[in-house]
Amino acid sequence: RLSWYDPDFQARLTRSNSKCQGQLEVYLKDGWHMVCSQSWGRSSKQWEDPSQASKVCQRLNCGVPLSLGPFLVTYTPQSSIICYGQLGSFSNCSHSRNDMCHSLGLTCLEPQKTTPPTTRPPPTTTPEPTAPPRLQLVAQSGGQHCAGVVEFYSGSLGGTISYEAQDKTQDLENFLCNNLQCGSFLKHLPETEAGRAQDPGEPREHQPLPIQWKIQNSSCTSLEHCFRKIKPQKSGRVLALLCSGFQPKVQSRLVGGSSICEGTVEVRQGAQWAALCDSSSARSSLRWEEVCREQQCGSVNSYRVLDAGDPTSRGLFCPHQKLSQCHELWERNSYCKKVFVTCQDPNP
């Protein structure tokens, strides 16, 4: 009668550099087992409603589940299992042949540091204090954490921030990303990307707010001094930011090598994997150190750019130095130079 909903259920996420994402392993009576994505009658390529795995994320002190499906970079330990019945049930499982098992991956949101809610209600006699000014980033439906339209709330008033492209506001953007516990400012988002256009069927809390703000002091050091209230404008841009703490990050894998610690670099765009094309702006080992770390391998031994004599070779391109800075990947439809990376193998 064991399921991941049970209070004493134990799980962990491995093969990534974060406890909040990776290959799902569960603890059953005889030890830790990797869960095959073919479990519960699913196909190995099937993606699931991730919120079903909330309990796993919650017990790992992570945020909401973002994706549940094939992990794709399958590392098979001693024991892998296929389970039957309802998704999330582990009462009927059998050992799987390792070469038949595609591992199940789960990505939970990396949580911002917040204090846990207290369980005792406040005394009814104390008046409710005025809420301090706060910010919120409203992502597009299914969009990224730490990316979106900025909303500012002061007391009971809240709304977007009017923004002109000529505003010199780099200091302010860094301050806002930092205040949101999202790291530093990377870039402004066009409104289509940030999710300005609202679906009429969207829940009430994501409908346009009645208040609008204008930047008052771009060198402010406390929120109450940054903005002033203005009459809402029908046209004009609103402030939409991408901060360095955005999630989910680009996932990478190494394919075609003799172990999971070497191979041609591939990255994921949605559910598809494609070769990562060489970028002359990122020819340092920093990018490959990050890739090696994601595979849970040691540091980079070597990397070499494979010749792209083929005009039809396609792939994905990231213009930044590190993949972790890549908010979006660009398609390259010809002359994609692949990169073969060898990392130190911790388990030779």
């Epitope: 909903y5 699931e48 409603d49 991730p50 919120s51 079903q52 909330s54 309990k55 994320c57 919650q58 002190n61 992570c62 945020g63 909401v64 589940p65 998704l87 939970c108 949101l109 949580p111 911002q112 917040t114 846990p116 809610p117 369980t119 919120q136 980033l137 954490h145 730490c146 516990q181």
Partner: nanobody, 121 residues
């Protein structure tokens, strides 16, 4: 503070029906999974039924086909329709929810105080 308050328990004869409700209130940004658990005297707490925010459901084998879990996301309320009740369904039924207090907060868990369901033969 997030509070879960269950209602709808009571004494019913075998074969009868009950509908449990659980209302969540407090500093909730969003609720992920919500579920019903039960604990009979001298036994461990067990999962009865769970529903995800996407509407996917999970039922314990012992209640499949008899119990139906549902939720009203707008009201932050969870329901459990229990039909064809059996004496072995007698237990204290607890509501449980995983929730965010703000966008990007860790997921926290909250439990209700429980509501007694007694099925007489």
């Amino acid at each position: 503070q997030v509070q879960l308050v269950e209602s709808g328990g009571g004494l019913v004869q075998a074969g009868g029906s009950l509908r449990l409700s659980c209302a969540a209130s407090g500093s909730i940004f969003s609720i992920s999974v919500m579920g019903w658990y039960r604990q009979a005297p001298g036994k461990e707490r067990e999962t009865v039924a769970v529903i995800s925010s996407g509407g996917s459901t999970y039922y314990a084998d012992s209640v499949k086909g008899r119990f139906t879990i549902s939720r009203d996301n707008a009201k932050n309320t969870l329901y459990l329709q229990m039909n064809s009740l059996k004496p072995e369904d007698t237990a204290v039924y607890y509501c449980n929810a995983d929730f965010e207090t703000a966008s990007g907060s860790p997921l926290y868990e909250s439990w209700g105080q429980g509501t007694q369901v007694t099925v007489s033969s």
